[in-house]
Interface confidence: medium
Amino acid sequence: MNNSTNSSNNSLALTSPYKTFEVVFIVLVAGSLSLVTIIGNILVMVSIKVNRHLQTVNNYFLFSLACADLIIGVFSMNLYTLYTVIGYWPLGPVVCDLWLALDYVVSNASVMNLLIISFDRYFCVTKPLTYPVKRTTKMAGMMIAAAWVLSFILWAPAILFWQFIVGVRTVEDGECYIQFFSNAAVTFGTAIAAFYLPVIIMTVLYWHISRASKSRIKKDKKEPVANQDPVSPSLVQGRIVKPNNNNMPSSDDGLEHNKIQNGKAPRDPVTENCVQGEEKESSNDSTSVSAVASNMRDDEITQDENTVSTSLGHSKDENSKQTCIRIGTKTPKSDSCTPTNTTVEVVGSSGQNGDEKQNIVARKIVKMTKQPAKKKPPPSREKKVTRTILAILLAFIITWAPYNVMVLINTFCAPCIPNTVWTIGYWLCYINSTINPACYALCNATFKKTFKHLLMCHYKNIGATR
């Protein structure tokens, strides 16, 4: 912070290191970025609150991220602008420490939320059979709470109490920085923990996700029938959700009246019980067939060689009367877990021949959900998810790298970096909070539509926007 002198009085006059037009420019640019950050993240939060189709586990992570980014937009950005423009810290040591604690805790929480989202996508792709069962609202809440609590524990005590630990406050009244950052090695250590480590983890996760996605797409291309799906190559995943031992009607107990219309079967009490434990997902652009086992008679279930063969898990409970299969070709925008396209969920089994029956049912349904091929299918959902994660990763690296590279250089060469470069680097980290809503939310059509409704004040059917 270059502070010029006012020779007319005896005390040091800490004045702005910038000319008037530069101050106006900085305030306008910083103010605009702050405003965009605030609006973008409020839109994300309000959208999730008002639209029940957006109330999914994945979007709870986004809500937490938006909270962190909103705080950065409201407090961090504006206070840093004030500090930069004036050339000194005008608000005293207490506000300084509170600002720094908030800044670092929230920035770290934002990074941790990015990590959670990356891990979530990673597990969705690599453990499609086991992970979605564990992926509950409660677990999401616990992960989010852990991110915030851990960020708080890591930064707040050190920032607020370091002066008392060492017995002296070395930060002057006109200055505002973390006291223990006086040591370049300590600064670099924190950069490793807050940036380099998360980047390495996120890159490794992305590599695994893209590799898993590519291998799936290759598998799909080998199966000619799969390519008939216009949205993406179909991939069938079977998983047991929960064995249901209630004395529910068996598959042929007079449920034939539930005819499948447009690839969707009306929900019946059996289905509702079957899928109760599941996360509320936005059925954006999805084709789902529910309770089909209940809707098909035994004599209907015949082997069909032209359909995709699936390997389904089976319930060990042989006494379970109920078989419930739910197939859905889901569009995993940012709100659904499985980037696999056709999911088959099997609950319970109908006696000894459960396995065989489930296999045949699944094949039958997969065939039903197929649609005629179109000339140019859009990019597969696997690719879309991979591309979204790449956008997340790149946005994070591009915005956080300059500052952290400077911290690395600074360890070996203290005066090599001018103050203006430090300021730009620091600001770029904040800009990640501006980009995040665009990176995540705008990848999802439901978010886009909800945003539009909110911005145009169309509140009428906003809660059901898909």
Epitope: M1, N2, N3, L12, L14, V168, R169, T170, V171, E172, E175, Y177, I178, F181, S182, N183, A184, T187, F188, Y403, M406, V407, N410, T411, A414, P415, I417, P418, N419, W422, T423, Y426
Partner: nanobody, 121 residues
Framework: QVQLQESGGGLVQAGGSLRLSCTAS????????MGWFRQGPGKEREFVAS????????QYADSVKGRFTISRDNAKSTVYLQMNNLKPEDTAVYYC??????????????WGQGTQVTVSS
């Protein structure tokens, strides 16, 4: 706020000596690198001498090497500039400068209001 107060300036004959002092009102003086700059009439401000936070490293402008000595007393939060064998071209306003470099933030750069040194021939 950080304040730097220079003293010891005045009128001296060529070949004479002066000792400038700069006292800093800071919490931890040892965190600052200290320096002296000067600005002659109608000239740009120029570097004279500097000393590291611990006092182990010093640096001088070629024009003052062998004549000026910079030192510091961290206990008194004061930096000194001993000027010997003064020349008329040393006439200028002498400014005290304190610099604290914070990793991840850059330089905190402070200046005193200056003290006048006039060397008559």
């Amino acid at each position: 706020q950080v304040q730097l107060q220079e003293s010891g300036g005045g009128l001296v004959q060529a070949g004479g000596s002066l000792r400038l002092s700069c006292t800093a009102s800071v919490r931890t003086f040892s965190n600052y690198g200290m320096g002296w700059f000067r600005q002659g009439p109608g000239k740009e401000r120029e570097f004279v001498a500097s000393i590291s936070w611990s006092g182990t490293m010093t640096q001088y402008a070629d024009s003052v090497k062998g004549r000026f000595t910079i030192s510091r007393d961290n206990a008194k939060s004061t930096v000194y500039l001993q000027m010997n064998n003064l020349k008329p071209e040393d006439t200028a306003v002498y400014y005290c400068n304190a610099v604290k470099y914070i990793p991840g933030r850059g330089e905190y750069d402070y200046w005193g209001q200056g003290t006048q040194v006039t060397v008559s021939s």
